[in-house]
Interface confidence: low
């Protein structure tokens, strides 16, 4: 004896991504030579059989016998989504539902709101938005590789009234340490089965100069040529270079871009040797002590910032 | 955050060749400038090269000239140096450094950013 349940059909429920395949799958033990079916939400009959009973070529089958019929649907949209229904014509009639979910793949992330020439501990302020995705998508930010606590993602319902619109702010200060660094917004749903989706935006920070002065060659003799190159960093770089030196007349004469030169050394050479870097965010003096009776100059560790 | 990691080290024997690399991650170094330094035992850290954003400027130590050469590939934020003809006085930790400016600095004072090193042994 078979019992009543062996009439029931039994089907799953399906995830499929928007333009993806989705494979209806409809078994049963008994058919009590019945054949079963596969209906849409709208109650339309997809298949009965092996026979197609809805013209549309998106939908196809995949195998029919007297226990089984799965069909496929390709090129799955928005639409498509709701329960789908396997009946077989037993009396009474049987069914087992599928409910069918398509989720909407977010789009690239557009990041808005960056001020371009930010100056060092500014204040940056980022806005990164995605549309499409369905359920609503996550996003995060990230600074290199440093993650950025954002604002909460806020959710808004596209006007298809099926997928949603995620945003999200982040606000840092920045560093000189931030010029060239990529800020980037990424966004996770499950659609993307753990592919990146982000966008970044290089942000350029503007900070004062700083220098310090390399002889060349590093320990000089009397009587040799000597270089004392002044070496600016800083965002500009600095685009001037003024050499005085401790009870002289200001300012030296300079040559070879920003580098002193010593044609031919003597004692009198000796002294201390300021270098000032300048740029439009500021200037800043390194100093330098010359002994040319000692064959090794050393540095002095002091330097002013203006 | 920021890592810089040196490779390529080894033993050679005196008038061979190495080639060292350094790959970056963690911000967008191809933007700035990158330096090799050296430092033997029981001796202060040496400049040997550096080379500018677009390796179209590139610097070396009196002691690296005619046989190192340094060269970067930004597409792959790497920085690399060529070392002939090497002698026993060659013998160091090779680092790696990178400076939070655009500019190439001589200096290890000039370097905000330093890899591990890699051990270059030059013996027969």
């Known amino acids: 004896n078979l019992s009543q349940d062996d009439s029931q059909p039994w089907t799953s429920d399906e995830t499929v991504v928007a333009g993806g395949t989705v494979v209806l799958k409809c078994q049963v033990k008994d058919h009590e030579d019945s054949s079963l079916q596969w209906s849409n939400p709208a109650q339309q009959t997809l298949y009965f059989g092996e026979k197609r009973a809805l013209r549309d070529n998106r939908i196809q089958l995949v195998s029919s016998t007297p226990h089984e019929l799965s069909i496929s649907i390709s090129n799955v949209a928005l639409a498509d989504e709701g329960e789908y229904t396997c009946s077989i014509f037993t009396m009474p009639v049987r069914t087992a539902k599928s409910l069918v979910t398509v989720l909407g793949i977010p789009q690239k992330p557009i990041i808005t709101g960056y001020k371009s020439s930010l100056r060092e501990k500014e204040t940056a302020t980022l806005n990164c938005q995605s549309s499409g995705s369905k359920p609503a998508a996550q996003l995060t930010w990230r600074k290199g590789d440093q993650e950025l606590h954002g604002d909460q993602t806020r959710i808004q319902e596209d006007p298809n009234g099926k997928t949603f619109t995620v945003s999200s702010s982040v606000s840092f200060q920045v560093t000189r340490e931030d010029d060239g660094a990529n800020i980037v917004c990424s966004v996770n749903h499950e659609s993307l089965k753990g592919a990146d989706r982000s966008t970044s935006q290089r942000i350029e920070v503007l900070y004062t100069p700083t220098a310090m002065i390399r002889p060349e060659p590093a320990h000089p003799r009397e009587g040799q040529k000597l270089l004392l190159h002044c070496e600016g960093r800083g965002n500009p770089v600095p685009q001037q270079y003024v050499w005085v030196k401790e009870g002289s007349e200001p300012p030296l004469k300079m040559t070879q871009e920003s580098a002193l030169i010593f044609p031919f050394l003597n004692k009198s050479d000796s002294g201390t040797y300021g270098c000032t870097a300048t740029s439009n965010m500021g200037s800043y003096t390194a100093y330098f002590t010359l002994n040319v009776n000692d064959p090794s100059p050393v540095p002095s560790s002091s330097s002013t910032y203006h | 955050q920021v890592q810089l990691v040196e490779s390529g080290g080894g033993l050679v024997q005196p008038g061979g060749s190495l080639r060292l690399s350094c790959a970056a991650s963690?911000?967008?170094?191809?933007?700035?400038?990158r330096g090799w330094f050296r430092q033997a035992p029981g001796k202060g850290r040496e400049f040997v090269a550096a080379i500018d954003y677009s390796g179209g400027s590139t610097n070396y130590a009196d002691s690296a000239k005619g046989r190192f050469t340094i060269s970067r590939d930004n597409s792959k934020n790497t920085v690399y140096l060529q070392m002939n003809s090497l002698r026993a006085e060659d013998t160091a930790v090779y680092y790696c450094?990178?400076?939070?400016?655009?500019?190439?600095?001589?200096?290890?004072?000039?370097?905000?950013?330093w890899g591990q090193g890699t051990l270059v042994t030059v013996s027969s």
């Open positions: 450094a990178a400076p939070a400016s655009r500019r190439p600095s001589w200096d290890a004072d000039g370097y905000d950013y």
């Open positions: 963690g911000r967008t170094f191809s933007n700035y400038a």
